[in-house]
C-alpha cells in the first residue's frame, strides 16, 4: 500500500550533467543544457516528484511526473520506460506499482540518487546512449559502481 504525501519540483541530471527533459514525442531524454536553456525549456525540464508512504520499510517511494499540457507520469510497465497521461494517484492498494520508484541516496554520496523500480527489484532508471540520443531506460544493475544509474536531483521549489 502506498499513500501520497507531498510533492516537489525538481530538475534531474545524469552524472555527465545532462538534463532530463520530455521531448515533443513524450520521450524522456537527456541533453546538455545551460541553466538558462533549462529554464527556457520549462516545464519540459521540471519534474514533479511525489513522495509516498509505504506500508513496508523499503525506502522513499516516489512517482515522477511532468506537466506540459496535461500531467504525465513515468511508468516502467513491462520494463519499458514511458510517460503515461495520468495524475499520480493518492493511493495505490498494492505493494508494487509500475509508477512507484524507490529514491535511494548512494552511501557515501548523499547528493547522488538512484531510482529502483518497485515492480522489478534490482532494476533502476538509467541513462543510455542510443545513436545520438541519451535515453532514460530501466536497467538491471549489472556492475558495481555503475554511473549510468546515478542522478542528481535539484529541488526547484
Amino acid at each position: 500500500y502506498f499513500g501520497k504525501l507531498e510533492s516537489k519540483l525538481s530538475v534531474i541530471r545524469n552524472l555527465n550533467d545532462q538534463v532530463l527533459f520530455i521531448d515533443q514525442g513524450n520521450r524522456p531524454l537527456f541533453e546538455d543544457m545551460t541553466d538558462s536553456d533549462c529554464r527556457d525549456n520549462a516545464p519540459r525540464t521540471i519534474f514533479i516528484i511525489s513522495m509516498y508512504k509505504d506500508s513496508q520499510p523499503r525506502g522513499m517511494a516516489v512517482t515522477i511526473s511532468v506537466k506540459c499540457e496535461k500531467i504525465s507520469t513515468l511508468s516502467c510497465e513491462n520494463k519499458i520506460i514511458s510517460f503515461k497521461e495520468m495524475n499520480p494517484p493518492d493511493n495505490i492498494k498494492d505493494t508494487k506499482s509500475d509508477i512507484i520508484f524507490f529514491q535511494r541516496s548512494v552511501p557515501g554520496h548523499d547528493n547522488k540518487m538512484q531510482f529502483e523500480s518497485s515492480s522489478y527489484e534490482g532494476y533502476f532508471l538509467a541513462c543510455e546512449k542510443e545513436r545520438d540520443l541519451f535515453k532514460l531506460i530501466l536497467k538491471k544493475e549489472d556492475e558495481l559502481g555503475d554511473r549510468s544509474i546515478m542522478f542528481t536531483v535539484q529541488n526547484e521549489d
Partner: antibody
Framework: EVQLVQSGAEVKKPGSSVKVSCKAS????????ISWVRQAPGQGLEWMGN????????YYAQKFQGRVTITADESTSTAYMELSSLRSEDTAVYYC????????????WGQGTLVTVSS | DIVLTQPPSVSGAPGQRVTISCSGS????????VNWYQQLPGTAPKLLIY???HRPSGVPDRFSGSKSGTSASLAITGLQSEDEADYYC???????????FGGGTKLTVL
C-alpha cells in the same frame, strides 16, 4: 557529510524510562529512516526499530513492541528513542543510525549513548 | 535470539586473505540483501558492504561481499593490522518483520 550527535550517558533505576536523542546536522533528515540499535556490554548488535521522519511511520522489533517509542522532530532534525519499564538487561550502548539508501542499510551512525540500569 | 550465524572469531597474518561467513535461512538471507558492518574497538559500527557486494565510497576494495542461497560471506584480502575489529552481517527477516544481525565475528590480525 551528515553527523549524528547523541545525548549523554544516563543512569536509571529499574522500572523507570529513558529518552535518548539523536540530532542530525549537515544533511537531509526528514525523508530517510532513523533506526535505533543497541549493544549490551560485550555483546552483538540488536535492532530496536526505526522511524521515517517525513511520514512519521514507525517500525518496531517484536521484542520491544509496547516498550519502545521512537519519535522525530523535523524542525530540529532530532530523533528520539524512549524505552520504558527498564530492567538491568537493558544496560547497553544505544546507537541511532541513519538509512539514506534503504531503511535497513545503516550508512551513518551516532557515537552511542550508554544507558546503565542499576538500583 | 540471533537469527544469522557467524563464527565467533577468525584470524590471519598481515597480507593474508580471510573470509567471514554468515548463515541464515530462506526467511532472511535467502530472499533479502545482506549488509556488513565493521566495528573497531570502542567505536560505533561502520557500513562496510551493502546490498550483498556494494562498497560505500571510502571503503577499500580489499573488502568484498558475496551471497549464495541462504549464506553470505565477507572477504578481506591483504590483511592489515587496522582491520582488527568485530564484523557483523545484517539482513531483513520477514518471519519476524525485523532486521536481524549476526552475532558478530572478532577478527584478529596475528
Amino acid at each position: 557529510e551528515v553527523q549524528l550527535v547523541q545525548s549523554g550517558a544516563e543512569v536509571k533505576k529499574p522500572g523507570s524510562s529513558v529518552k535518548v536523542s539523536c540530532k542530525a546536522s549537515g544533511g537531509t533528515f526528514n525523508s530517510y529512516a532513523i533506526s535505533w540499535v543497541r549493544q549490551a556490554p560485550g555483546q552483538g548488535l540488536e535492532w530496536m526499530g526505526n522511524i521515517i521522519p517525513m511520514t512519521g511511520q514507525t517500525y518496531y522489533a517484536q521484542k520491544f513492541q509496547g516498550r519502545v517509542t521512537i519519535t522525530a522532530d523535523e524542525s530540529t532534525s532530532t530523533a528520539y528513542m524512549e524505552l520504558s519499564s527498564l530492567r538491568s538487561e537493558d544496560t547497553a550502548v544505544y546507537y541511532c543510525a541513519r538509512a539514506a539508501y534503504h531503511p535497513l542499510v545503516f550508512d551513518n551512525w551516532g557515537q552511542g549513548t550508554l544507558v546503565t540500569v542499576s538500583s | 535470539d540471533i537469527v544469522l550465524t557467524q563464527p565467533p572469531s577468525v584470524s590471519g597474518a598481515p597480507g593474508q586473505r580471510v573470509t567471514i561467513s554468515c548463515s541464515g535461512s530462506s526467511s532472511n538471507i535467502g530472499n533479502h540483501y545482506v549488509n556488513w558492518y565493521q566495528q573497531l574497538p570502542g567505536t560505533a559500527p561502520k557500513l562496510l558492504i551493502y546490498r550483498n557486494n556494494h562498497r560505500p565510497s571510502g571503503v577499500p576494495d580489499r573488502f568484498s561481499g558475496s551471497k549464495s542461497g541462504t549464506s553470505a560471506s565477507l572477504a578481506i584480502t591483504g590483511l592489515q593490522s587496522e582491520d582488527e575489529a568485530d564484523y557483523y552481517c545484517q539482513s531483513w527477516d520477514y518471519s519476524g518483520f525485523s532486521t536481524v544481525f549476526g552475532g558478530g565475528t572478532k577478527l584478529t590480525v596475528l
